[in-house]
Interface confidence: low
């Protein structure tokens, strides 16, 4: 396809408290150039979960090496899930811009639900 698509294959993921949640996201094209960000929620009040470009996100690890050229897999894993992490997570592609990057396209979202820790 000519135009980049952001694919979040799972509509929902259920994880037990204390476990790690893997949220999958893939791009269909390298261009336009720009970083990927993950958010919980949508709109002005959304919470930044991961920024490929900068920042420190101690609970988040990437499934593949994002700094490598040709990478189209932007899946993340969030460790030590708690009920407060429940919500819909969006993988968002930004277009390289100056001075600020511009939001280009968002995935459809993956709803994370948190089950009680097994006793």
């Amino acid at each position: 396809e000519d135009e980049l698509q952001v694919i979040q294959p799972e509509k929902s993921v259920s994880v037990a408290a204390g476990e790690s949640a893997t949220l999958r996201c893939a791009m269909t094209s390298l261009i336009p150039v720009g970083p990927i960000m993950w958010f919980r929620g949508a709109g002005a009040g959304r919470e930044l979960i991961y920024n490929q470009k900068e920042g420190h996100f101690p609970r988040v690890t990437t499934v593949s090496e994002l700094t490598k050229r040709n990478n189209l897999d932007f899946s993340i894993s969030i460790s030590n899930i708690t009920p407060a992490d429940a919500g819909t997570y969006y993988c968002v592609k930004f277009r390289k811009g100056s001075p600020d990057d511009v939001e280009f396209k968002s995935g459809a979202g993956t709803e994370l639900s948190v089950r009680a820790k097994p006793s």
């Epitope: 336009p32 150039v33 040709n70």
Partner: antibody, heavy 118, light 107 residues
Framework: QVQLVQSGAEVKKPGASVKVSCKAS????????MHWVRQAPGQGLEWMGW????????NYAQKFQGRVTMTRDTSISTAYMELSRLRSDDTAVYYC???????????WGQGTLVTVSS | EIVLTQSPATLSLSPGERATITCRAS??????LAWYQQKPGQAPRLLIY???NRATGIPARFSGSGSGTDFTLTISSLEPEDFAVYYC?????????FGGGTKVEIK
């Protein structure tokens, strides 16, 4: 050093196909996208598409979709561009170009002249 | 697709003179623009990327500036080997597109 060496000039008849090769050396072939760009005689540069040598995934310019096929052979670090149903206006120099660390096209192959003539 | 318009089409100058080539994009490409040099019978060579960064091994007499829709390539003092065709290219939007080229010829 990073080098791209292309196959030699070709003369084809209208309706035929041509397959141009681009052999890479001096870097990890599967680590960088390869693009193809063509240049008609006395004209400018026209992007045709790219191939991800790692996965084999491709992305073609709309103009060439259905006529172009980009492939690769990782065992010999070579990318290929095949153009079918050739017309006289496909006469051009065809270049492969590696997508460099800064996202731009660097370096380029030396070019392959494809002449389409009856 | 993004259209890049270069001007002038031809620039006639003498060695030692300053060359200024402009590239205008049909919509903003931020700073995501490159310049290439092509000599007769040769492949293009990357000169400037991200509007103003010189590629490896490119002499300091080449400089690039601009952002948004208007960009400039400047050669501060032309050397004999600089007479060639210069192309701008954008990669912010798909598909990547090139300008029509500017020929810098000896006056």
């Amino acid at each position: 050093q990073v080098q791209l060496v292309q196959s030699g000039a070709e003369v084809k008849k209208p309706g035929a196909s041509v397959k141009v090769s681009c052999k890479a050396s001096g870097y990890t072939f599967t680590g960088y996208y390869m693009h193809w760009v063509r240049q008609a005689p006395g004209q400018g540069l026209e992007w045709m598409g790219w191939i991800n040598p790692n996965s084999g995934g491709t992305n073609y310019a709309q103009k060439f979709q259905g006529r172009v096929t980009m492939t690769r052979d990782t065992s010999i670090s070579t990318a290929y561009m095949e153009l079918s149903r050739l017309r006289s206006d496909d006469t051009a120099v065809y270049y492969c170009a590696r997508e460099g660390d800064e996202d731009w096209f660097d370096p380029w192959g030396q070019g392959t002249l494809v002449t389409v003539s009856s | 697709e993004i259209v890049l318009t270069q001007s002038p089409a031809t620039l006639s100058l003498s060695p030692g003179e300053r060359a200024t080539i402009t590239c205008r994009a049909s919509q903003s490409v931020s700073s995501y623009l490159a310049w290439y040099q092509q000599k007769p019978g040769q492949a293009p060579r990357l000169l400037i990327y991200d509007a103003s960064n010189r590629a490896t091994g490119i002499p300091a007499r080449f400089s690039g500036s601009g952002s948004g829709t208007d960009f400039t390539l400047t050669i501060s003092s032309l050397e004999p080997e600089d007479f060639a065709v210069y192309y701008c290219q954008q990669r912010l939007f798909h598909p990547p597109t090139f300008g029509g080229g500017t020929k810098v010829e000896i006056k």
